[in-house]
Interface confidence: low
């Protein structure tokens, strides 16, 4: 089942992890003297692993929803343990024996592996916003083909549920050009329905461009155009946006 930890608690936990990692990185890069000879490469490897781990954490930390709690706790625990071990060795580090550094390095590699198991809430190249993932097409299709394209990736041609979402999508589309959304009156003229069958809420009427929808020449499908919405011929090829819920991690 999905972890129920409130976002604020989860956020604090993740910030704590990041803080620990930052301190650990600082210890390694500033307080530990640069070693000579054979230890140098191992120290560089440890530093590199820490940097990569930090980058990975930073790339995931803005999304506080649905992270795998047990993995997160494990990472936090390992960081604490690793920090304690590093601090205890700091006076004699780098030691003549590479084994201690090797152990630290292996722990870091293990932690990075754990971190990679934290699920990405959105697939690569999708954009996360308000608990949803958005795919902005790089090519163009007619409206029906855009609907199909989204279904094929287990998503829907975008349905707008909030003003924040509308603002974000309109701005993104404006930079690119006319872009299909999942709204049409194909079933019944002048009855605007989203692809999930729901009707267009009156509170979104304000987003039509001036004089739209005008249905000039069988314009039954809706696009983001300029600063608002426009009804357009469904057979025209345009960019499109798919939307699906962000995937929460499951326990176990």
């Amino acid at each position: 089942q999905v972890s129920k930890t409130p976002n604020t608690e989860r956020q604090k936990e993740q910030e704590k992890i990041l803080q620990e990692l930052t301190q650990l990185t600082d210890e390694l890069t500033s307080r530990i003297p640069i070693s000579q000879g054979k230890n140098e490469s191992m120290q560089a490897k440890i530093t590199e692993q820490l940097m990569q781990l930090k980058t990975e954490l930073l790339s995931r930390i803005p999304i506080f929803q649905g992270q795998n709690e047990s993995i997160q706790e494990k990472i936090s625990e390992q960081l604490m343990q690793l920090k304690a071990e590093l601090l205890s060795k700091i006076s004699s580090f780098p030691v003549k024996d590479d084994s201690k550094q090797e152990k630290i390095y292996q722990q870091l590699v293990q932690m990075k592996t754990e971190l990679f198991r934290l699920c990405r809430l959105c697939p690569w190249d999708w954009t996360f916003l308000l608990g949803n993932c958005y795919f902005f097409s790089k090519s163009q299709r007619n409206w029906n083909d855009a609907v199909t394209a989204c279904k094929e990736v287990k998503a829907q041609l975008v349905i707008i549920n909030s003003d924040e979402e509308q603002t974000f999508l309109q701005q993104t589309s404006k930079a690119k050009g006319p872009t299909w959304m999942g709204l049409s009156d194909l079933k019944k003229e002048a009855t605007w329905l989203w692809v999930d069958g729901s009707t267009l809420s009156s509170r979104f009427q304000k987003y039509w461009n001036r004089g739209e929808p005008n249905n000039i020449g069988e314009e039954d499908c809706v696009e983001f155009a300029g600063d608002g919405w426009n009804d357009s011929k469904c057979e025209l090829k345009k960019f499109w946006i798919c939307k699906k819920s962000a995937t929460p991690c499951t326990e176990g």
Epitope: Q140, A149, K154
Partner: antibody
């Protein structure tokens, strides 16, 4: 997650050749674009085309002129078919997922 | 070593979404490695010394605290509206 190209060879001008890109650790089906990019010896990168794995739609630059064709042959493989090869097609051919994850490349010599 | 370098990438036409531009690092005998995507987003595992900026037609890659290992050829790649141009194009490399 990895990509691996295969099928590179030494061929004569006018010949045809098919390169295969095999994915491991993920399916090429879904919301990915699979790209082919080539690099002539000592030269820069050149985009050959892409396939939208969701439905197999393809796009090519104008210079391809129908000589190259990209297709998805299974849930883990994408191919690049090349015809009427000339010496100018001599290059290392890379496949890439969303131009983010790249294979090591395969050498084609004409 | 230790310095900063700036590489510019200029596109003859506007990039899709004004930011569909990536930066790559390539070393001899290796495939390109993604450094930056969407103009300024750091790819996973890439040090924060690499920074991308720009929008529309003008983009910049800045590498600070240069290391010997940064010696490589750097390419930019832009995504375009496929209906009016080739979908993608690479810069000539630096």
């Amino acid at each position: 997650e990895q990509l691996m190209e295969s099928g590179g060879d030494l061929v004569k001008p006018g010949a045809s050749l098919t390169l295969t890109c095999t994915a491991s650790g993920f399916d090429v089906s879904g919301s990915y674009y699979s790209h082919w990019v080539r690099q002539a010896p000592g030269k820069g990168l050149e985009w050959i085309g892409m396939i939208y794995n969701g439905d197999g739609s393809t796009w090519y630059p104008s210079w391809v002129n129908g000589r190259f064709s990209i297709s998805k042959t299974s849930s883990t493989t994408v191919t690049l078919q090349m015809t009427s090869l000339t010496a100018a097609d001599t290059a290392t051919y890379f496949c890439a997922r969303d131009l983010g994850l790249w294979g090591p490349g395969t050498l084609v010599t004409v | 070593v230790g310095g900063t370098v700036t590489i510019k990438c200029q596109s003859s036409q506007s990039i899709v979404y004004n930011n569909y531009l990536s930066w790559y690092q390539q070393k001899p005998g290796q495939p390109p490695k993604l450094l930056i995507y969407q103009a300024s987003t750091l790819a996973s595992g890439v040090p924060s010394r690499f920074k991308g900026s720009g929008s529309g037609t003008q983009f910049t890659l800045t590498i600070s605290d240069l290391e010997c290992d940064d010696a490589a050829t750097y390419y930019c790649a832009g995504g375009y509206d496929c209906s009016s141009a080739d979908c993608f194009a690479f810069g000539g490399g630096t």
